[in-house]
Amino acid sequence: FNISGCSTKKLLWTYSTRSEEEFVLFCDLPEPQKSHFCHRNRLSPKQVPEHLPFMGSNDLSDVQWYQQPSNGDPLEDIRKSYPHIIQDKCTLHFLTPGVNNSGSYICRPKMIKSPYDVACCVKMILEVKPQTNASCEYSASHKQDLLLGSTGSISCPSLSCQSDAQSPAVTWYKNGKLLSVERSNRIVVDEVYDYHQGTYVCDYTQSDTVSSWTVRAVVQVRTIVGDTKLKPDILDPVEDTLEVELGKPLTISCKARFGFERVFNPVIKWYIKDSDLEWEVSVPEAKSIKSTLKDEIIERNIILEKVTQRDLRRKFVCFVQNSIGNTTQSVQLKEKRG
């Protein structure tokens, strides 16, 4: 199709080489509040273009994204050629940064309902650059945490080194939806709730003498509880003895609950005590079996192919640790009678 009639938007993604960050493109027209509509081509010079829905009730969820190769080749369907780019409804998610993401991206509805809808498309010219200047050493992260129940703020990474007074007007989105009355470079949250979690996008316009473009940054906001003040507790095994059958295989499970920590380095391991000797056992990897805002339950099993007489003289110890401290639980095997 002919893309010359598409509305055009220029975007700049300046990524930090120090951190993982994502980027998004919205299939929208220049004005955010018109994101569900499209100008028809004029039928005659006297007729005013009217707003018509792109997709009727489907609300733009059924759009097609293309990339325009720089060598003039035909448009390429994003889904077929770019595994690091994911389409979610009318949003294109770039999972990894890199200058190779620079280019022209075109979106339009899959269903063209009339010949006048052909110009119902948006062309986004994306320029991707690594951050070069070290002038802003403490720029805001693309991953920001808000502590539940307390006051916090969400900063636009590309503007976090500017004072509020000199900051340009910012357009904010949350999970792809326009936050129409948030326009400063930093959003203050007086009391943090779980619904403040999400993907925030901040846009502002930058211009030079020739043209203007939108500078965009994506911030993943996580709502968290305060770091735990407790060491982990072992939920299983509860008993310190376990009845077993000699010659049979045995799996002993250690389940431990770890309170939330922003920097989370849980340790869960099995070791064996035999008289004065003690050694760690190589066992299958630990796995998280339940995760909530407040805590995580992690399990690690020790597997004995065959219970021997020698195992009855040993103690099997589960050791768990976080930054606060450690806990152990030992199990002595006992032969099942009868």
Epitope: D59, L179, I187, E191, Y193
Partner: antibody, heavy 123, light 107 residues
Framework: QVQLVQSGAEVKKPGASVRVSCKAS????????MHWVRQAPGQGLEWMGI????????TYAQKFQGRVTMTRDTSTSTVYMELSSLRSEDTAVYYC????????????????WGQGTTVTVSS | DIRMTQSPSSLSASVGDRVTITCRAS??????LNWYQQKPGKAPKLLIY???SLQSGVPSRFSGSGSGTDFTLTMSSLQPEDFATYYC?????????FGGGTKVEIK
């Protein structure tokens, strides 16, 4: 308890302006957006716009663009809605209504409403 | 703008009846739908938000359902104090828009 108290009834002539106030109490004023909604006699509800009390940022319904101005005074926890170039069709009860969730939020619902201010436009 | 169409515009019912009001959006609004109750001379009162969440203090006989374009408010057993006008409202995008209202009258 959370309360929104609005200014009293107004009678205005066509072409004039009216300013309605809404004083908030019982919560942190800057934490919640404020909406303005009007209701003409015997008619339904019509959303006019929203203000973020923290920065004073506003969004207005297209229908009122150019005629409505929403402002706030954080020192008195009060929001104001001014409507200019009044015409007879602007005769209505005007409500302020607090957004239900702490900002920033996509709009969730208006959980507390003022008692309403009757504005009558008549020559 | 997103148009919200409510039906019926009015209905007559008796105490104890199960009453259902529907609301249709002109485009998909996910679950961004709220329901309000308004009595004559009073301000509206929020009943349901996010299509199906009950606002605190609202009796459990009120329930909401639906997503996308079609939504329903149900009153499982109508009480004398429930005779009022009910409005749906989308909060998907500005301008926020209301349905035309459904007046629930005593039969």
């Amino acid at each position: 308890q959370v309360q929104l108290v609005q200014s009293g009834a107004e009678v205005k002539k066509p072409g004039a302006s009216v300013r309605v106030s809404c004083k908030a109490s019982g919560y942190t004023f800057t934490s919640y957006y404020m909406h303005w909604v009007r209701q003409a006699p015997g008619q339904g509800l019509e959303w006019m716009g929203i203000i973020n009390p923290r920065g004073g940022y506003t969004t207005y319904a297209q229908k009122f663009q150019g005629r409505v101005t929403m402002t706030r005074d954080t020192s008195t926890s009060t929001v104001y809605m001014e409507l200019s170039s009044l015409r007879s069709e602007d005769t209505a009860v005007y409500y302020c209504a607090k957004e239900g969730r702490v900002s920033p939020t996509d709009y969730y619902g208006m959980d507390v409403w003022g008692q309403g201010t009757t504005v009558t436009v008549s020559s | 703008d997103i148009r919200m169409t409510q039906s019926p515009s009015s209905l007559s019912a008796s105490v104890g009846d199960r009453v259902t009001i529907t609301c249709r959006a002109s485009q998909s609004i996910s679950s961004y739908l709220n329901w309000y109750q308004q009595k004559p001379g009073k301000a509206p009162k929020l009943l349901i938000y996010d299509a199906s969440s009950l606002q605190s203090g609202v009796p459990s006989r009120f329930s909401g359902s639906g997503s996308g374009t079609d939504f329903t408010l149900t009153m499982s057993s109508l009480q004398p104090e429930d005779f009022a006008t009910y409005y749906c409202q989308q909060s998907y995008s500005t301008p926020l828009t209301f349905g035309g209202g459904t007046k629930v009258e005593i039969k």
